[in-house]
Amino acid sequence: HTVELNNMFGQIQSPGYPDSYPSDSEVTWNITVPDGFRIKLYFMHFNLESSYLCEYDYVKVETEDQVLATFCGRETTDTEQTPGQEVVLSPGSFMSITFRSDFSNEERFTGFDAHYMAVDVDECKEREDEELSCDHYCHNYIGGYYCSCRFGYILHTDNRTCRVECSDNLFTQRTGVITSPDFPNPYPKSSECLYTIELEEGFMVNLQFEDIFDIEDHPEVPCPYDYIKIKVGPKVLGPFCGEKAPEPISTQSHSVLILFHSDNSGENRGWRLSYRAAGNECPELQPPVHGKIEPSQAKYFFKDQVLVSCDTGYKVLKDNVEMDTFQIECLKDGTWSNKIPTCKIVDCRAPGELEHGLITFSTRNNLTTYKSEIKYSCQEPYYKMLNNNTGIYTCSAQGVWMNKVLGRSLPTCLPECGQPSRSLPSLVKRIIGGRNAEPGLFPWQALIVVEDTSRVPNDKWFGSGALLSASWILTAAHVLRSQRRDTTVIPVSKEHVTVYLGLHDVRDKSGAVNSSAARVVLHPDFNIQNYNHDIALVQLQEPVPLGPHVMPVCLPRLEPEGPAPHMLGLVAGWGISNPNVTVDEIISSGTRTLSDVLQYVKLPVVPHAECKTSYESRSGNYSVTENMFCAGYYEGGKDTCLGDSGGAFVIFDDLSQRWVVQGLVSWGGPEECGSKQVYGVYTKVSNYVDWVWEQMGLPQSVVEPQVER
C-alpha cells in the first residue's frame, strides 16, 4: 500500500518495526514538501535480508523519474548497499520510498528506522542553467530565492533578467557618441533601446560605428536574438548584428532613430557609434581691412558662425551703424547671412563744450579720430582749471575723449577770485566821504533786492552781497531774514529775492545781470538780538557768466583772529542810507538823495578791545562778539558807514596777490551814521570759511589754493 506524507519532517519504519518485518510485503511512502525545499533522508537502523543486487528484500528511494538509491542487507558489499551514514537528498520536493520483502526470509530481519526532513534549496548556488539563473544578483531565502539588478537596471517581468530603460534618448548636438548600455561591458538583456538624433533642419546626420561591434547573432538566421535597426523617415536600415560593424552611413536626413533590441540571454559587449552633422559649405571669407575674423578656418559649413572684429581704434561699420563686433552665419543653402562689414576708424566726434573754457585741436585738420589730441583751456583771466589739470584729451579706442587724470570727465573751470579787471587804487591816502568806483573795480559787488509779497502792501528792502563763485553770493543774515513779527529767524522765501551783478550805475541796469535765487541759507546760529553770526548765502538759479564786471572775491583762510588791527580794507556800496528812498527808486531811475554810481571807501580795522569799549560805553545792549570786527575812524565821517548791509569789506592778501572778503557790513549805531567813535561792525568771515564751503558743497581743499598761491 501507499502512504502519502506531506509534513516537513517525519519517521518511516519497516512494518512491525522493531520486530522482524513480514514476508511478501510492499509499502510505498510518497513524501511531498513545498517547492524550494528538497528532502533529506537518513537511516538510524537498517537490517534487511542480503541478496545479489538486492533482488529479495530492499528499500528503494526514487523521484518521479529517477532512482536515487536501493538499499538491502546489513553491511555494504560489492553487490549490495546499506545506507550506513549516507544521507539521501532528493533533487526536488518529492521523494518516494518503497520497502519490499520477498516470500521467504531465512532469518529474522528487524527492518529499518528512517527519518526525513525538508531542507532548503540554495537556488543561487545550484542553478547551472542560464535560462533559470539570475542575471545579476541572486538572493536565497528558506523556501525560495529572488533576483535583483545592478544600479540603473530594471528587473524584467521574467523576474530573472535585468534590462535597462533606454527608450528616451534625445541627441540634439551637432556631434555625439552613442553606445549600447554599459558599453564596453555586456549590454543588458531583455531591453528595447531607442536613440533619437534630432538636428536643426538643414543638417544631415552621418553615422560611423567604432571600436568593438559585438551583438549576439545566429549562424543561419539573420539577427534573430539581438539587433540594431536604423530608421530614417520611412526607410529602415538593418537589422545589424554579429561582430562586423556596418559601413559608415550617410542618412541624408536631420532626424534619425536608432533601435536596439536584446533578448533574455547572451553575453555580448555591444556597440559604439559616433554621429556628425554635415551641412552645406559656405564660400571662403576675407577679413576686412584693419580687422579680423574668428574662428579662422579653411572651410565653413552650415551653422558655423564667424565674429568680425576690428583692430584697436577701429569700429565695425554695418549699414552705417557702428558696433564692436559683428557676427555672420553660414546658412543652410550655403550662403552667408550677411556681407563682411568694414572697419572704420573710431571717431570721438566734436568734444564736449567746456563751460567757461575753450578747445584747441593739436591734430591737423581738427581731426577727431582715434589718437587725435585736443586741449581744453579756461577763459582767462576769469577762470582757471581745477587742480592745474593739463587739459589734454586723446581720442580713445572706445570713441571717447580721455584725460590721464580725469578719464572721460571734463575739466572744471573755476572762477578766479579777487582779481578785478582794473587795479584798485593805492591805499595810501584816505578818501573822505567815499568816491566813485570805476566799472570793474568791485566785480564781486551784488545788489540784493528782497520783495516780500506775503504782506500787503508788499514789503521791499535791499542789501549788498559778494560773489563767491558763479552761483553763490555771500551776504549778511539780517538782509535775508524774513521780517516776521516775532523774533524767529526764518529765511525769506527764495521767490522774493533778486540779485543784481555787474551793476555800476543804478540808473542803468542794461549792463547788469539779474538772477533769481535757488536757495537762501542763513547761518543756523544767527541771533536777531545781537546780530551774532550775521552771515548768509544765496545760491543763484543759474550760474552767472564771469567777465570784467562780474568776478568772485576770494574767501579768507580759516583764522579766528580775523584781519589785523589798522589793516586797511575797502567797502563799496550805493550809499543808500535815506529811509525815505524806496527800493523801486533805487532800482529804477535813481534819486538825487543817494549815489547813482557805486561808491567805495577805505577804512582801517579797529582793535577789538577799542571797539568793544566804544559800544559798551553807550546806552543800550550792544555786544561786539568774537565773530565780529570793527572798522572806521575815531573821528567819524560819512565814509564810516557808506556800505550797504551785507556788502564785502575786502583786504588785499599779499601772499596770494588777491582781494579777500574779510568782513560783511553788519551793524552800527545808535547815533547818526558817521558820528564820532561810531565804528561800523562787520561779520568776521574768516570764522565761517568751513561753513561757507560746506553750504556750497565744495571741499575746502579744492578752492583754498586760490588764496594761498
Epitope: S454, P457, D459, Q483, T487, I490
Partner: antibody
Amino acid sequence: QVQLVQSGAEVKKPGASVKVSCKASGYTFTGKWIEWVRQAPGQGLEWIGEILPGSGSTDYNERFKDRATFTADTSTSTAYMELSSLRSEDTAVYYCVRSEDLWGQGTLVTVSS
Amino acid sequence: DIVMTQSPDSLAVSLGERATINCKSSQSLLNSVTRKTYLAWYQQKPGQPPKLLIYWASTRESGVPDRFSGSGSGTDFTLTISSLQAEDVAVYYCKQSYTLPTFGGGTKVEIK
C-alpha cells in the same frame, strides 16, 4: 473782486469751542498772511494772530497762544480760527484780515450760559 | 509787547477844520533792515470793519482822500485830517506791526 467772506454768527456756552471760517477770493490765497482781530462790544481792536496759508506758518498773540488755533485749506481758499475754552469775555466780533488792507465783514461770537 | 497810546480819546472838530490825532509807541517802530516805520492808521465807522488809511507811518492807501495824512518817526506819530468832512465821523485806530501787532485804544472823531 478781492474779498473775504466770513461764516455766520455763533452762540456758544462757556467752555465750548468755536470755529470761524474766512473764504478768500480774487487773489492768490496761499501767498498772503491772514490775520485775526477781535473787537468786544463797544471796545477797541485786539490782534489775535496770523497764518500764512501756503506754508502753514503762524504767529500768535501770547494771550491767545493756548486757546487759538489757525488752519487753512488751500484747496478751498479758506482760513479758519478755532477758539477753545470760551468764556463770557470772549464775546466779540471776530475779523479776518488780509495782511493789513482787506477785512472780512466780521463774525459775532456770543458766549453765554 | 509794544504799547500804543492814542490821544485824545475823543475829538470834536468843526466841518472843514483840521483834526489831529496822536499815537505814541513804547519803542521805535523803524526797522533798520527794511528802513520802514511799521505804523498804520485805520478808520472804523459804526457797524463796519476797520478800513486802512495810512501805512508805513506816512504812505496813503490808494483810494483814500488826500485830506488824510500821516507823519512822525521813531516813537511819535500823527494822523491829520486837513479839512474834516461829515463822512469822516468815525473811530480812528493806530496799529504797530514792527513786532506782534498791537492797536491804540482809538480816538472818536465827531463834528462840533
